[in-house]
Amino acid sequence: IINGSDCDMHTQPWQAALLLRPNQLYCGAVLVHPQWLLTAAHCRKKVFRVRLGHYSLSPVYESGQQMFQGVKSIPHPGYSHPGHSNDLMLIKLNRRIRPTKDVRPINVSSHCPSAGTKCLVSGWGTTKSPQVHFPKVLQCLNISVLSQKRCEDAYPRQIDDTMFCAGDKAGRDSCQGDSGGPVVCNGSLQGLVSWGDYPCARPNRPGVYTNLCKFTKWIQETIQANS
């Protein structure tokens, strides 16, 4: 997250970190069910761990943390690497979470976002771009949903209805390491960090997010079919 600020503790209990060995964060994710996460499909890896209820990026033990293995990864069937359409994936955890103030699911919004909607994006991604700089703790950033026309103008021929753009003033954006993390609008999960300009946070180049309102049926049916 570029030019965000430290999230208040306990305010993002659905935020997950996907870790490669040894405790190397590579993507964010979102708890949407006691045993299921949503993340970006481009975050797919064979072997990874999931950390929930953790505030700092470092692997130091926190009393609220819960660790899991991802036992099943189900990318959306319309996703094709390395494209960005249909960029979402469900991950089944090896067990159900223990609900606490630090770990609980969020509902996926069934309403598509309208321009001007205020949202919050969070993650442990780099705080500088194009060089990489790790934050100490989870970062939060207020962003506004842009109209689909402004989105398409910013990224000609790259935007479809499985994406939406959101941003703020130049110099504020999601970035590397935030992929798969949540965009929360009006208390519901509206999007996942997917892509954006390179380097991040360029003027008139908003972040691009997976438009989850288009996928509520697939999410529900996939969880039911694999539970």
């Epitope: 490669l20 190397q24 964060l25 590579y26 993507c27 970006a40 481009h42 975050c43 390395p82 494209g83 960005h84 991604g125 780099t126 060089q131 990489v132 790790f134 990224y155 000609p156 021929r157 790259q158 999601s174 970035c175 590397q176 390491g177 935030d178 992929s179 798969g180 960090v193 997917s194 892509w195 954006g196 300009d197 390179y198 380097p199 991040c200 360029r202 180049r205 691009v208």
Partner: antibody
Framework: QLQLQESGPGLVKPSETLSLTCTVS??????????WSWIRQPPGKGLEWIGN???????YYNPSLKSRVTISVDTSKNQFSLKLSSVTAADTAVYYC????????????????WGQGTTVTVSS | EIVLTQSPGTLSLSPGERATLSCRAS???????LAWYQQKPGQAPRLLIY???SRATGIPDRFSGSGSGTDFTLTISRLEPEDFAVYYC????????FGGGTKVEIK
């Protein structure tokens, strides 16, 4: 299958501007999934990264070359270009263009497709 | 600027032997941002390993990468005749840079 082909003059005079073009075939530059790079290799030496460009035109340059480098993209021609000003004999090298994958995960996918390289000699 | 130092400069080995190449960074580099390339005379570099340990498409499993922080290693478990080449590490954590290379030559 994606292919990259560098082209441009093989001989440039000192103090002039070196101009090279990389033509992409079998794939499209206007893709949000990739960035495009220039790398060079002086005779008998190692590789030096020059800079990257995204399809949108956003660039990222090697700090040591930044004052002399311009990388641009022409999506209609499926090409990207390098200009290096005020060249000296030290800029004599094989110049490569390459492609790298890009997303917002904490991950560097490496540069997976390279051109065969073009030799540029700086001499009067 | 992160400087990558590769050692040894030259490695003289016979086919079938194991090759261990080192890449040391002047400051800590996320392992996710480290790649290895192979270059043969007159050819462009070829991506072998990305993310310090993941093999690129079509790369044989005798090539493996490991390491974290400032120390990274490329291992070729059993050298084949076509493996004799120059190998470069690259980091993209800071402004991208390459190591000076290690030449693997036939003993």
């Amino acid at each position: 299958q994606l292919q990259l082909q560098e082209s441009g003059p093989g001989l440039v005079k000192p103090s002039e501007t070196l101009s090279l073009t990389c033509t992409v075939s079998g794939g499209s530059i206007p893709s949000s999934s990739y960035y495009w790079s220039w790398i060079r290799q002086p005779p008998g030496k190692g590789l030096e990264w020059i800079g990257n460009i995204y399809y949108s035109g956003s660039t990222y340059y090697n700090p040591s070359l930044k004052s002399r480098v311009t990388i641009s993209v022409d999506t209609s021609k499926n090409q990207f270009s390098l200009k290096l000003s005020s060249v000296t004999a030290a800029d004599t090298a094989v110049y490569y263009c390459a492609r790298g994958e890009y997303d917002r995960s904490y991950y560097f996918w490496g540069m997976d497709v390279w051109g065969q390289g073009t030799t540029v000699t700086v001499s009067s | 600027e992160i400087v990558l130092t590769q050692s040894p400069g030259t490695l003289s080995l016979s086919p079938g032997e194991r090759a261990t190449l080192s890449c040391r960074a002047s400051q800590s580099v996320s392992s996710s941002y480290l790649a290895w390339y192979q270059q043969k005379p007159g050819q462009a570099p070829r991506l072998l390993i990305y993310g310090a340990s993941s093999r690129a498409t079509g790369i044989p499993d005798r090539f493996s990468g490991s390491g974290s922080g400032t120390d990274f290693t490329l291992t070729i478990s059993r050298l084949e005749p076509e493996d004799f080449a120059v190998y470069y590490c690259q980091q993209a954590f800071s402004s991208p840079s390459f190591g000076g290379g290690t030449k693997v030559e036939i003993k």
